[in-house]
Amino acid sequence: CKAMHVAQPAVVLASSRGIASFVCEYASPGKATEVRVTVLRQADSQVTEVCAATYMMGNELTFLDDSICTGTSSGNQVNLTIQGLRAMDTGLYICKVELMYPPPYYLGIGNGTQIYVIDPEPCPDSDF
């Protein structure tokens, strides 16, 4: 297993609709054809997997159908979007990149992006 540098923004504020996007950029030492990207959430020392996708270079990222993540890739950059976020989802979102094929296997973990989320103000009840 060889180490690889991964860069991501330090902080992002989600939109009022609970959507946060950020770029995860990795310094690929070789010509990888198969890449796996995992988003981890760290909150209060607990780390949980948010979503993961494996893609072939030049192809779209494919997350599971029920995933809250979507993404696109361009060269050594992955543009990740996380949807359906609530205030309670505020936390550090860490990008983990693995170069799966061809060998050698490379692993890179970013410092994390602190995503802040604020629940929208509830709409006042209407009389209709």
């Epitope: 330090a10 902080v11 504020l13 209060d44 802040y116």
Partner: antibody, heavy 117, light 107 residues
Framework: QVQLVQSGAEVKKPGASVKVSCKAS????????ISWVRQAPGQGLECMGW????????NYAQNLQGRVTMTTDTSTNTAYMELRSLRSDDTAVYYC??????????WGQGTLVTVSS | EIVLTQSPDFQSVTPKEKVTITCRAS??????LHWYQQKPDQSPKLLIK???QSISGVPSRFSGSGSGTDFTLTINSLEAEDAAAYYC?????????FGPGTKVDIK
């Protein structure tokens, strides 16, 4: 090294607007946010809100909603805070600070805004 | 909104004495609590981040502890240059909030 340099002191009349700038250097501007904090004479620190320089999204203090606008210009690495309909109790020193993963590690030198008729 | 309360409001201390300032959050904020020092006519300066993590360049006499709702800033062996206001600040959830501050002066 990281620096936040703010614009100079302002004297405004009640009802006017003020726009304070905060020029950042020494780091990748869009990787962080910029918060704005004010301090009335002899008082504590009050969070006015912040802006994510990465995407321009903002979060304002509820008591200032509708009167404050925070923006960034990523071409010049500068953040701006505009406060409208100024009142005498808006007289304060206004600070910008870099928002990282939690702590605010760098602050501007402060801008004194005086509202007086 | 998470409300932070600090005690005491004011403390007058002799040099070399130990100072303890407490900060209480209205709900659990984990360790997302930071301490700032502000000297007269100066910008605030980060002293301690994430409840207990030290900051490069800050004297080792400053330390922090706590998690959840109760936090403490300790100044061991106070020096004359430590006369300042001290603020706690939470970054656990929006909106960000500060405590009202504790003013420390030298007897």
């Amino acid at each position: 090294q990281v620096q936040l340099v703010q614009s100079g002191a302002e004297v405004k009349k009640p009802g006017a607007s003020v726009k304070v700038s905060c020029k950042a250097s020494g780091y990748t501007f869009t990787d962080y946010g910029i918060s704005w904090v004010r301090q009335a004479p002899g008082q504590g620190l009050e969070c006015m809100g912040w802006i994510s320089a990465y995407n321009g999204n903002t979060n304002y203090a509820q008591n200032l909603q509708g009167r404050v606008t925070m923006t960034t210009d990523t071409s010049t690495n500068t953040a701006y805070m505009e406060l409208r309909s100024l009142r005498s109790d808006d007289t304060a020193v206004y600070y910008c600070a870099r928002v990282g993963a939690g702590d605010w590690d760098y602050w501007g030198q402060g801008t004194l805004v005086t509202v007086s008729s | 909104e998470i409300v932070l309360t600090q005690s005491p409001d004011f403390q007058s201390v002799t040099p070399k004495e130990k100072v303890t300032i407490t900060c209480r959050a209205s709900q659990s904020i984990g360790s997302s609590l930071h301490w700032y020092q502000q000297k007269p006519d100066q910008s605030p300066k980060l002293l301690i981040k994430y409840a207990s993590q030290s900051i490069s360049g800050v004297p080792s006499r400053f330390s922090g502890s706590g998690s959840g709702t109760d936090f403490t800033l300790t100044i061991n062996s106070l020096e004359a240059e430590d006369a300042a206001a001290y603020y706690c600040h939470q970054s656990s959830s929006l909106p960000f909030t500060f405590g009202p501050g504790t003013k420390v002066d030298i007897k």
